[in-house]
Structure formats: structure tokens, C-alpha cells
């Protein structure tokens, strides 16, 4: 059946031969209605990429550099299956490119000019492309030829395989720049030896190099890693201190109509039957005809790449920056240490309009980028399309797991002028019911629930975490008869109560009328039995404080809070009747942009923060008629975090533990991608 056929692209006679053997052996073990292999031969990997894009083939395995080519328009391919190395229990799909230095040296990443450098080889990923790509804009002009610019940047180098005649400085530490193991400083171990011997000041290698060359921890402790934020870390902290994370070898397919499920089905079956130590007659990860045919010989198996993971996310911001710099050779005109405009990520059109107004008032210091969901915004910040946004704690957790960092906290209770330097304890997550109902925390089953959105703190993580520990399963849509939890599956009973309008029904943004704190409260007012919100929601939307038609006549005393002990209390008593304390919303950014974002926001709030009294004739950053656009409307200021500058420290151990427990119920495709 053609639609069940995966057309594998081969790039040599030997690969074509192995592909045919792969095809024949898969035919013998798979049912006739299962996936099958067809082989397409092309002259190069780039030809394979074009063939897949043109629907003349379906799949090929590529190195990271080629995954980048495959992702570029007009190819638009995406990673679908990753080879893994190491054990099945601890599968490695990535390696980390690192800059290793001796502990007793005292320079940082931004002080490499004039140092001596050790590289694995010219044109190699960890040893050349990544470090030189990231340093590209610091190289002296003209930057072409690249080797000359690098020679003029470092005071001496060993770059195996470089032309020692044209660029003698690149071979200063290893005369002749030998391109094989005859050169003692060749490849990973050689580059590390170049540092160890004292020939060079820095070695550009992969994270495992130091462990492979120094078995003794005491010896390893003589070395450190240079981090991109101009700090240093120990060599075992490579996950938090690297130049780039590089995918090893990846199967790519079309982004649309790419047969990714079929490709996975095929490769999963293939590894079961012909993986490491599975079969004598055909081996997926070796070949008598040559090395690394179709797949790497060192691979141990395959892992399915999560569907939310596109090529940008898979390759990572640092890797793409490095390769793009090298390929395109363009650098910003402004010096790299100068803050460019900060690109704020706005959710849907309501936030975009407020962001645009902010942009005009900031005279362009703020630019705007839009996305339809919070997770899409986080992804845009990760890949550099946006820089920052303010997030509920539940999304601070996801953003943190995706490598972003908290920059400033929203403060709600501290009056100026101390606000900016005060760390607040957080707000209360509460369950609100109508005073006229007889509901308690213990009889919510079968009732109608209203949530701010899936994945948010007060509206989801806290109440559903508590519920999970009571019911021990994740079928929350069965516990409540119906509800509105924006971000739920559209056919779920937890979208039944949402107001839309269609096609925005149950979308986790302001186009859904029951989204957010105010939306969840409105859902309670109009349709629901219980709303999970912040403790300030009822006072902020009653007594005429919200002029919208649905809210203008509401009275605070018509609502009560549910306490965990089964009692109920007035909405004025959240301190004695809440579900949990929630961390304040916080602004997040990429690490490389964090200082810039902080400086700019502190400046912006001095102009447009809560000191502005007349918001009808002035732009106010923390005002949007109860809609919480960009920031919560009750924000008094954005406050410095001091030492709470990681998501774990910011959210606190207890909350992180609660959200981690809920991950077994996670519906977050982004979280799945970021933890791949």
C-alpha cells in the first residue's frame, strides 16, 4: 500500500544496498498491512532533503548541521525520530559543546580575545562551528576569510586540518595542523591535551571529553567550563553551562503530511527486530558495506521526537545562532552589549493591541510579537523570535523546564517606594462558590467547574493537584460534570461550559470569554458551581469595580470561599481559607537577554507603572479594565528577584514538587518537548 510505504533516502551505493536489505528484512517481519520500506537513491544529503520536501522521498537521517539546512525554507522539514546512544535506561540524544579552561585561569567567555585556543578540527561542530559561530560578531573585521579573522582574534591556536601556510597562527600550538591522530592535539582528546599541556588557554570540545580523559574527579576539579553568561561552572554542570546542545543524528520528514507516525512505527519495529544484539542476518546499526550507513553504528536505538518539537526547538537557540552567524555572516550594527529593543510576547489580539500601545509609548524600545497560546509564546522566546513575557507560576515552571529564567516578579501588595526591592510571599489560590449554594470542598464531584486555564497555578495546578491526591487519577473531566478549563481538549467536558465565541471556544487566551481570573469568575456567575481563582478576584469584580454588563451589579457577599477542612468563609478571609499559597506571576526571558529585560522594564515602570494616576489619558502598563493584559491589573510594581533567579528558587520547593507530581496528568506538549 503506497500510503503505508516509507521512502527512505540513501546517499551512496553502499547505503542503497543496505536500504534494500532493510526493506527485504522488514518485509519478512511485518504484517502485509503494516509499514513498508522503499528506497530512493540520491547523490547527497542535500539532494535527499530536497527530495523529501518535494514528496519524492519521506525520510533520511542527518547530522545536526544538515538538520539546520533541512529546516530552512523552502525545505521546511522537521525532526521526527532521534537516534540515541548509551543505555536504554539513560538514552543520550544530544551532546553539549563546551569551552573548557583551567580553574586557576581568571578570564570569562567575553574575554577570549588574545587567548590561546585548542580546537578539535576545522569545520567540526563542537571544536569550530559552534564556538566560532557564537564568537563571530566579536571577531575583528573583515571576517572573511574566517580563518584569518580567527587567527587575529586568538593569540595562537591549534586548529587541526587548517591551512598552516596561509594561516600560520592557527597552527602555532600544533605545527602543521595535522589532520589525523599523528597530530597529538587532533580531535576531542587532542584538543583537551592541548589545554592540559598548557599549550592553550581554552579547549572547545564536547561535554564527555573531559570525563573520557580524566577518570579521577580530583583531576577533573582542576578544570571549569566557561558559560555564555560570562560565569564559570564545574565540568559536571555542563547542562547549565555550555555553548550549545547539539542533536547527534536525526530522522527528518516533511512538516505537513510527513508520515511521522508511520516512520516511527517502522523504526520502532525495526529496532525491536534488528536493533543492537537482536539479529544475526541484518543489523540496523552496522553494515559489512561501510561505516554509518543509513544510521550511526554507535546508535543504540530510536526515540520518537515529541510532536511539539520543531527544528528550531530541537536544534536550540545557541546552535542556530552559531550556524546562522557562520552561514550568513551578518552581525548587528549596534555593539552586542547594547540592549536592542525587547520583543514582548503578546497573547492573541487583545494583548497585542495593548503591547502595540506600549511600543508606541516606549518609542520603540518595546517591540511586539504575538502567539495564540502561552506555550507558543514560551516557544517563541526560546527560539529568539520573542524575548520576554509575564507568566503565571504554572507557566514559569514550564518556561523554566525549557531553559528560560525568571527576571522580575509582579508585586501586588507592597506600596511604592519599597516595592521594587521587596520579595512578596505570593497570593492565595482559592475556590469560590455562590453563597446560596450548599457546596463544600468535600462534595464537588459532579459539579460544574470554572478554571483560569489548564496549567495555571490558582486555576489548575493547585486545585487539580489537591484533587489528584484525593482521587488518584487524572480524569478530572469525569470528576466534574462539566466545566470550562481553557486549553483542554475541545471535545472534553471541561470545554462544555466555555463561552467562546467559536472558533475560539476553550482557547487559552482572551478570545475565550471565560479565560483567566476574571473569565473563570464570570463562568461561575453565569453557569458554574465553583471557580478556582486568586483571592483578589471577587473583590476586584464586585461592587461596581468591573463596569462590564455581566459584573456591574455583583455583590461581594454573594460569594464565599471553600476551605480544605470542609467549611466555608467570607471572601474577606483568604488567609484562613485557601487551597494554597501561589507564587506571584513573573517575567521570564532567555538567560542571554535577562539583564537587558530587567533594565528596560525597571525603566518602563518608572514611566508607565502604578505612579501614573490617570489611565484614561496616559498609558498605564498595569491596567486593562480587569482583563489582566500583559500583566495582572493589580500589579503595583515589578520587583527584583535578588537570589531567586532560577525557576526552582523562585517558585519554591513545595510548589515545584506539587507541579512535578501533576506532570503525570500533564497535557503540556511543550513540557514534553522540553524534557525530551
Amino acid at each position: 500500500v503506497p500510503e503505508k510505504s516509507v521512502r527512505w533516502c540513501a546517499v551512496s551505493e553502499h547505503e542503497a544496498t543496505k536500504c534494500q536489505s532493510f526493506r527485504d528484512h522488514m518485509k519478512s517481519v511485518l504484517p502485509s498491512n503494516g509499514p513498508s520500506v522503499a528506497c530512493v537513491k540520491k547523490a547527497s544529503h542535500l539532494d535527499c532533503i530536497r527530495a523529501i520536501a518535494a514528496n519524492e522521498a519521506d525520510a533520511v537521517t542527518l547530522d545536526a548541521g544538515l538538520v539546520y539546512d533541512a529546516y530552512l525554507a523552502p525545505n521546511n522539514l522537521k525532526p521526527v525520530v532521534a537516534e540515541f546512544y548509551g543505555s536504554k535506561e539513560d538514552p543520550q540524544t544530544f551532546y553539549y559543546a563546551v569551552a573548557v579552561v583551567k580553574k586557576d585561569s581568571d578570564f570569562q567567555m567575553n574575554q577570549l580575545r588574545g587567548r590561546k585556543s585548542c580546537h578539535t578540527g576545522l569545520g567540526r561542530s563542537a571544536g569550530w562551528n559552534i564556538p566560532i559561530g557564537l564568537l563571530y560578531c566579536d571577531l575583528p573585521e573583515p571576517r572573511k576569510p574566517l580563518e584569518k579573522a580567527v587567527a587575529n582574534f586568538f593569540s595562537g591556536s591549534c586548529v587541526p586540518c587548517a591551512d598552516g601556510t596561509d594561516f600560520p597562527q592557527l597552527c602555532q600550538l600544533c605545527p602543521g595542523c595535522g589532520c589525523s591522530t599523528l597530530n597529538q592535539y587532533f580531535s576531542y582528546s587532542g584538543a583537551f591535551k592541548c589545554l592540559k599541556d598548557g599549550a592553550g588557554d581554552v579547549a572547545f570540545v564536547k561535554h564527555s571529553t573531559i570525563f573520557e580523559n580524566l577518570a579521577n574527579k580530583a583531576d577533573r576539579d582542576q578544570y571549569e567550563l566557561l558559560c555564555l553568561d560570562n560565569t564559570r561552572k564545574s565540568v559536571d554542570e555542563y547542562k547549565d553551562c555550555h555553548l550549545a546542545r547539539v542533536p547527534s543524528h536525526t530522522v527528518v520528514a516533511r512538516s505537513v503530511g510527513g508520515k511521522e507516525d508511520l516512520i516511527w512505527e517502522l523504526l520502532n519495529q525495526a529496532q525491536e527486530h534488528f536493533g543492537k544484539d537482536k539479529s544475526k542476518e541484518f543489523q540496523l546499526f552496522s553494515s559489512p558495506h561501510g561505516k554509518d550507513l543509513l544510521f550511526k553504528d554507535s546508535a543504540h536505538g530510536f526515540l520518537k521526537v515529541p510532536p511539539r518539537m520543531d527544528a528550531k526547538m530541537y536544534l536550540g537557540y545557541e546552535y542556530i545562532t552559531a550556524i546562522r552567524n557562520l552561514r550568513e555572516g551578518t552581525c548587528p550594527e549596534a555593539p552586542t552589549d547594547e540592549c536592542k529593543p525587547v520583543k514582548w510576547c503578546a497573547l492573541s489580539h487583545h494583548e497585542r493591541l495593548k503591547c502595540d500601545e506600549w511600543s508606541v509609548n516606549s518609542a520603540g524600545k518595546i517591540e511586539c510579537e504575538s502567539a495564540e497560546t502561552t506555550e507558543d509564546c514560551i516557544a517563541k522566546i526560546m527560539n529568539g523570535e520573542a524575548d520576554a513575557m509575564s507568566l503565571d507560576g504554572g507557566f514559569v515552571y514550564i518556561a523554566g523546564m525549557c531553559g528560560l529564567v525568571p527576571v522580575l516578579a509582579e508585586n501586588y501588595n507592597t506600596p511604592n517606594p519599597n516595592c521594587e526591592n521587596t520579595a512578596e510571599e505570593g497570593y492565595f489560590a482559592v475556590a469560590v462558590v455562590k453563597s446560596s449554594s450548599d457546596l463544600t470542598w468535600d462534595n464537588l464531584k459532579g459539579k460544574k467547574s470554572c478554571h483560569t486555564a489548564v496549567g495555571r497555578t490558582a486555576g489548575w495546578n493547585i486545585p487539580m493537584g489537591l484533587l489528584y491526591s484525593k482521587i488518584n487519577h487524572c480524569r478530572f473531566d469525569e470528576f466534574f460534570s462539566e466545566g470550562c478549563a481553557p486549553g483542554s481538549e475541545k471535545n472534553s467536558s471541561l470545554c462544555k461550559l466555555c463561552m467562546g465565541p467559536s472558533p475560539n471556544l476553550c482557547e487559552p487566551n482572551n478570545k475565550e470569554g471565560y479565560y483567566g481570573y476574571t473569565g473563570a469568575f464570570r463562568c461561575l456567575v453565569e453557569k458554574g458551581d465553583v471557580a478556582f481563582v486568586k483571592h483578589q478576584t471577587v473583590p476586584q469584580n464586585t461592587g461596581g469595580k468591573n463596569p462590564d454588563a455581566w459584573a456591574k451589579n455583583l455583590k461581594e457577599e454573594d460569594y464565599e470561599l471553600l476551605c480544605l477542612d470542609g467549611s466555608r468563609k467570607s471572601v474577606q478571609e483568604p488567609a484562613n481559607c485557601h487551597l494554597a499559597r501561589a507564587p506571584n506571576h513573573a517575567v521570564v526571558a532567555r538567560k542571554d537577554k535577562a539583564d537587558c529585560v530587567q533594565t528596560l522594564l525597571l525603566d518602563q515602570q518608572r514611566m508607565f507603572g502604578s505612579s501614573v494616576t490617570d489611565c484614561s489619558s496616559n498609558f498605564c502598563l498595569f491596567e486593562s479594565k480587569t482583563k489582566d493584559l500583559l500583566f495582572r491589573d493589580d500589579t503595583v510594581c515589578l520587583a527584583k528577584l535578588h537570589d531567586r533567579n532560577t525557576y526552582e528558587k523562585y517558585l519554591g520547593e513545595e510548589y515545584v514538587k506539587a507541579v512535578t507530581n501533576l506532570r503525570k496528568c500533564s497535557t503540556s506538549p511543550l513540557l514534553e518537548a522540553c524534557t525530551f
Epitope: D356, E357, S617, L629
Partner: nanobody, 117 residues
């Protein structure tokens, strides 16, 4: 509530000029920020230019150096002077008063600008 009415659009050749006006039925003097947006067929509405009460302006990269936004609080009017027009400037142009628009959709009818030879 202030109603905004856009005018001044039309058909113009590439390289030509147009001046759009946005007249408010009430006072715009207290409006913090006014802006012009445009929407081409099948595309999202995008910010073209904005101006604050104090006269701070911001332009989309694609129109910088060609378009100029101004406001006359006494006349309750916002203008967009468009020079060196290009075919890609073809769109319906809308004016907005942010203090009303971003929590509810208050958009006028817009004015069509077509740049074609």
C-alpha cells in the same frame, strides 16, 4: 463614546502619496495614544504608526522614512501622510484610540488604499 471615521484612501500609482485623516466625534485630547493599523487581504491587522499625547511616535519598519503620523487635538483629528507608496502598502487602513480598543473591538469602517500601476 468617541466614534472614529477614516477617510482619504484611494487608488494611487507606485511612488505616489496620500494623506489619510481620522476624525473623532468627540475630543481626542485626552486619548493617551492614537494609531493607524492596516489589514491586507488574508493577513493579520498590523500597526503602521502610533502617536502619544506628548507627540512620541513609532513606525513599523516597513514604512519608516515614508509615512508620517501627526495629531491635531484641537481639530480632534489624526493624520497619516503616506509618501513613496508601494504595491505592498495596499490594504484597508484603520485608525484607533487605544483607550477603547484593546479590551473591546472598536474599529471603524477603515479606508481602502490601493497602490497599483
Amino acid at each position: 463614546q468617541v466614534q472614529l471615521v477614516e477617510s482619504g484612501g484611494g487608488l494611487v500609482q507606485p511612488g505616489g502619496s496620500l494623506r489619510l485623516s481620522c476624525a473623532a466625534s468627540g475630543s481626542i485630547g485626552s486619548s493617551a495614544t492614537m494609531a493607524w493599523y492596516r489589514q491586507a487581504p488574508g493577513k493579520q491587522r498590523e500597526l503602521v504608526a502610533g502617536i502619544t499625547r506628548g507627540g512620541t511616535t513609532k513606525y513599523a519598519d516597513s514604512v519608516k522614512g515614508r509615512f508620517t503620523i501627526s495629531r491635531d487635538n484641537a481639530e480632534n483629528t489624526v493624520y497619516l501622510q503616506m509618501n513613496s507608496l508601494k504595491p505592498e502598502d495596499t490594504a484597508v487602513y484603520y485608525c484607533t484610540d487605544y483607550s477603547r480598543s484593546y479590551y473591546e473591538d472598536h474599529w471603524g469602517q477603515g479606508t481602502q488604499v490601493t497602490v497599483s500601476s
